[in-house]
């Protein structure tokens, strides 16, 4: 789903139709470029595969919150 329209910008044109288990997600980045047709979130899974998701969906927002908290909590 991410398409590199140039070296700097990656766009999403479709979103996953699935709620993905947060345990499978490693990180995310937001796509907000005006060069892209829609705002998106690209999740990277624990096996480094990328998935475009709709930032308006609650599970996407919850997953981003979860990943943010993981990042803020130092591992002992």
């Amino acid at each position: 789903q991410p398409d590199a329209i140039n070296a700097a910008v990656t766009c999403c044109y479709n979103f996953t139709n699935r709620k993905i288990s947060v345990q499978r997600l490693a990180s995310y980045r937001r796509i907000t470029s005006s060069k892209c047709p829609k705002e998106a979130v690209i999740f990277k899974t624990i096996v480094a595969k990328e998935i475009c998701a709709d930032p308006k969906q609650k599970w996407v927002q919850d997953s981003m919150d979860h990943l943010d908290k993981q990042t803020q909590t130092p591992k002992t």
Epitope: Q1, P2, D3, R18, S21, R24, K49, E50, I51
Partner: antibody, heavy 122, light 107 residues
């Protein structure tokens, strides 16, 4: 080891029923969609059905809708295919497969069972 | 349902040859296309997903390209273990569908 181990195939008469099982190990089964795919002798692959992580959402191909039921038991790390009203044309090797999300769509398969043969004949 | 047509249905090639397999979709599937290798009596093995992404552990001599209706799988230098049947699969929409396969045989 990450694997899917299948069981339950065999010979069944037309109109009969059979239940296939697929036991997952080496990964967190409850985090993944799962699918069944079949292959008639000497033929190509046909996707049959898939099921969401908690079993709440399921999709089927028209040729098995109403006759086959996909289910799962996450406590047992197991996937099932209940096949009823079997026909000769259902004779095939049946594979279970782990079903992943892609970039522009959902539903490709990165891990497969070895397959189990179902023969429908009188 | 989206139909996938693979060509050729079979081909003969020699070790070291560059081999190109094609898969044409009856309607647009964006980049939602995967390629699998299957050997007799075995389960299929994922090679390529998202039209061009190489699955982990798959040799770099395999590559995928294309979008819209036409996709290709290229084997840059055919190895003895590559003689098998190759299937494409679309995951753009339900029902998920496979192509009829291309059998790569030894010349």
């Amino acid at each position: 080891e990450v694997q899917l181990v299948q069981s339950g195939g065999g010979l069944v008469q037309p109109g009969g029923s059979l239940r296939l099982s697929c036991a997952a190990s080496g990964f967190t089964f409850s985090h993944y969609w799962m699918s069944w795919v079949r292959q008639a002798p000497g033929k190509g692959l046909e996707w049959l059905a898939n099921i969401e992580q908690d079993g709440s959402e399921k999709y089927y191909v028209d040729s098995v809708k109403g006759r086959f039921t996909i289910s799962r038991d996450n406590a047992k790390n197991s996937l099932y295919l209940q096949m009823n009203s079997l026909r000769a044309e259902d004779t095939a090797v049946y594979f279970c497969a782990r079903d992943l999300e892609g970039l522009h769509g959902d539903g490709y398969f990165d891990l497969w069972g070895r397959g189990t043969l179902v023969t429908v004949s009188s | 349902a989206i139909q996938l047509t693979q060509s050729p249905s079979s081909l003969s090639a020699s070790v070291g040859d560059r081999v190109i397999l094609t898969c044409r979709a009856s309607q647009g599937v964006s980049s939602a296309l995967a390629w699998y290798q299957q050997k007799p009596g075995k389960a299929p093995k994922l090679l390529i997903y998202d039209a061009s992404s190489l699955e982990s552990g798959v040799p770099s001599r395999f590559s995928g390209s294309g979008s819209g209706p036409d996709f290709t799988l290229t084997i840059s230098s055919l190895q003895p273990e590559d003689f098998a049947t190759y299937f494409c699969q679309q995951f753009n929409s339900y029902p998920l569908t496979f192509g009829g396969g291309t059998k790569v045989e030894i010349k």
